[in-house]
């Protein structure tokens, strides 16, 4: 911790400027008034402070604002933002998208950090929901950041906002997040024609249930293998060989390449080998011909 000393009169600080870079850690702690620092935070980012000096400045602000910094300070944190822990950020109340933009710019190259994820979470809480302006800001300044939000936070996205989400914004989303976003996307795009609907819904399909995947197989969508591989395992397993063939169209040949990877591997294990053979791809591992399949889970449910 920084030792307390008294400030020499000639070192007294009346404004935040570049002369401070020559102050030792102890002098900075003793001579910089936290209230002055907070009032002139907009100057800090243009001054080449050392990492050690930034630690002192953070310490000063922490002492002045033990309950969390005001947004007027947060907006101008600059490099100091990257010294904040998620615990620090959780104390903040952030409602301005200008603040979010400023800190996302500082975090470029660090978009998936815990700091950024916590900041976005605070913005969503502060604004009450994940509205279109917030989504637009995230997609513009932080592609992929949408997926840093918890499923609970994503549930506050109105379906009307889904159209602003681009495929690359969903690249890092996990199954639980797509489970939340898919029904909203389905609702948002429900009035579109078949081909247009598929283009729009495709990035969200990692959250689609079996019945919706089956429905798509009837629409000649020619799903690409990358999208198929992102489908939920539970959604793929009940599909028949004929349904998968119709779903993938000309891309069905790609199953051979993905034969050892889930969900393809698990799906193959569920199919009859003679059905797989009809694809002519040499897929192996299906249920041998003549074997009877007993679904014990059904029997357990009945007993």
């Amino acid at each position: 911790d920084v030792e307390r000393t008294t400030c020499p009169p000639e070192k007294e600080v009346h404004e935040i400027d570049e002369s401070l870079i020559f102050y030792k850690k102890r002098e900075l702690e003793a001579c910089v008034d936290a209230a002055l620092l907070a009032a002139q935070m907009d100057r800090v980012d243009a001054i080449p402070f050392t990492y050690e000096q930034l630690d002192v400045l953070k310490h000063k602000l922490d002492e002045l604002y033990p309950q969390g910094y005001p947004e007027s300070v947060i907006r101008h944190l600059g490099h100091l933002f990257l010294k904040m822990s998620p615990e620090d950020i959780r104390k903040w109340n952030v409602t301005s998208l200008e603040t979010l933009k400023a800190l996302l710019k500082v975090s470029k190259g660090h978009e998936m950090s815990a700091q950024v994820a916590t900041l976005i979470d605070r913005v969503v809480v502060g604004r009450g929901q994940l509205d279109k302006d917030t989504v637009d800001t995230l997609t513009a300044f932080c592609p992929g950041c949408l997926c840093s939000l918890s499923p609970e936070r994503l549930s506050s996205v109105p379906p009307s906002v889904i159209g602003a989400v681009r495929p690359q914004d969903l690249d890092t989303c996990g199954p639980r997040q797509l489970d939340v976003l898919y029904p909203k996307a389905r609702l948002a795009f429900q009035n579109m024609s078949g081909s247009e609907y598929f283009v729009k819904i495709r990035p969200f399909l990692g959250g689609a249930p079996t019945e919706d995947v089956k429905a798509l197989s009837q629409q000649n969508v020619s799903m690409d293998l990358a999208t198929f591989m992102k489908l939920r395992r539970e959604a793929v397993l009940p599909l028949t060989v004929a349904e998968v063939q119709k779903l993938l169209g000309p891309h069905v040949e790609g199953l051979k390449v993905e034969e050892q990877h889930s969900p393809v591997r698990d799906w193959i294990l569920k199919q009859r080998q003679d059905d797989l053979d009809t694809l002519g791809l040499g897929l192996q591992g299906g249920i041998p011909n003549g074997y009877l399949i007993l679904d014990l889970s059904v029997r357990e449910a009945l007993s």
């Epitope: 050392t50 990492y51 050690e52 190259g109 950090s113």
Partner: antibody
Framework: QVQLVESGGGVVQPGRSLRLSCAAS????????MNWVRQAPGKGLEWVAV????????YYADSVKGRFTISRDNSKNTLYLQMNSLRAEDTAVYYC????????????WGQGTLVTVSS | DIQMTQSPSTLSASVGDRVTITCRAS??????LAWYQQKPGKAPKLLIY???SLESGVPSRFSGSGSGTEFTLTISNLQPDDFATFYC?????????FGQGTKVEIK
């Protein structure tokens, strides 16, 4: 006086891993940021990665992102570069260098260690 | 990432000459630019930081200028010890990037 000494270089096959170290002395290691910079034979300097004084922030060049990991042990005054999935184009002299803050240049450099990726 | 472009890539000069090397950034980097000198088989050495500040111990014949996207390194009275390769580097973004280098050789 400030001294940075790299070690761990050598010949390695493509796809394999290597860990470089940089031993620091003559300054308060835990106060300063540390970088790795490399130079392929007969080529220019290429910045590889930086780690902040407390290890809280790390940044990488696109060419090594996902393959290389920069880390530090402040109790041992040592910087590391874990290099995985090595490629022929990673062949270079690797230098460690110090910076004192986000807006500071690289003021002290080690003498470098040669990494050769070849089958 | 910010791209740094140096020119010329090679420069032939004589002892006593005034030499100028240019460095251009793909976007504004304010004054956060450094110049380094490297001799064969040696580590780079910091000459200039913050576009125009001379690093301690560096001879005053070296000077730097510029801001935003255009920068220059000038050696006012080239000495035998100055024949080397010079690099610019931006440190405005956390992903620091170097120029491709300028080799100053004897004419």
């Amino acid at each position: 006086q400030v001294q940075l000494v790299e070690s761990g270089g050598g010949v390695v096959q493509p796809g394999r891993s290597l860990r470089l170290s940089c031993a620091a002395s003559g300054f308060t290691f835990s106060s300063d940021g540390m970088n790795w910079v490399r130079q392929a034979p007969g080529k220019g300097l290429e910045w590889v990665a930086v780690i902040w004084n407390d290890g809280s922030n790390k940044y990488y060049a696109d060419s090594v992102k996902g393959r290389f990991t920069i880390s530090r042990d402040n109790s041992k005054n040592t910087l590391y570069l874990q290099m995985n999935s090595l490629r022929a184009e990673d062949t270079a002299v690797y230098y460690c260098a110090r910076d004192r803050g986000p807006l500071w240049p690289l003021d002290y450099w080690g003498q470098g260690t040669l990494v050769t990726v070849s089958s | 990432d910010i791209q740094m472009t140096q020119s010329p890539s090679t420069l032939s000069a004589s002892v006593g000459d005034r030499v100028t090397i240019t460095c251009r950034a793909s976007q504004s980097i304010s004054r956060w630019l450094a110049w380094y000198q490297q001799k064969p088989g040696k580590a780079p050495k910091l000459l200039i930081y913050k576009a125009s500040s001379l690093e301690s111990g560096v001879p005053s014949r070296f000077s730097g200028s510029g801001s935003g996207t255009e920068f220059t390194l000038t050696i006012s009275n080239l000495q035998p010890d100055d024949f080397a390769t010079f690099y610019c580097q931006q440190y405005n973004s956390y992903s620091r990037t170097f120029g491709q280098g300028t080799k100053v050789e004897i004419k």
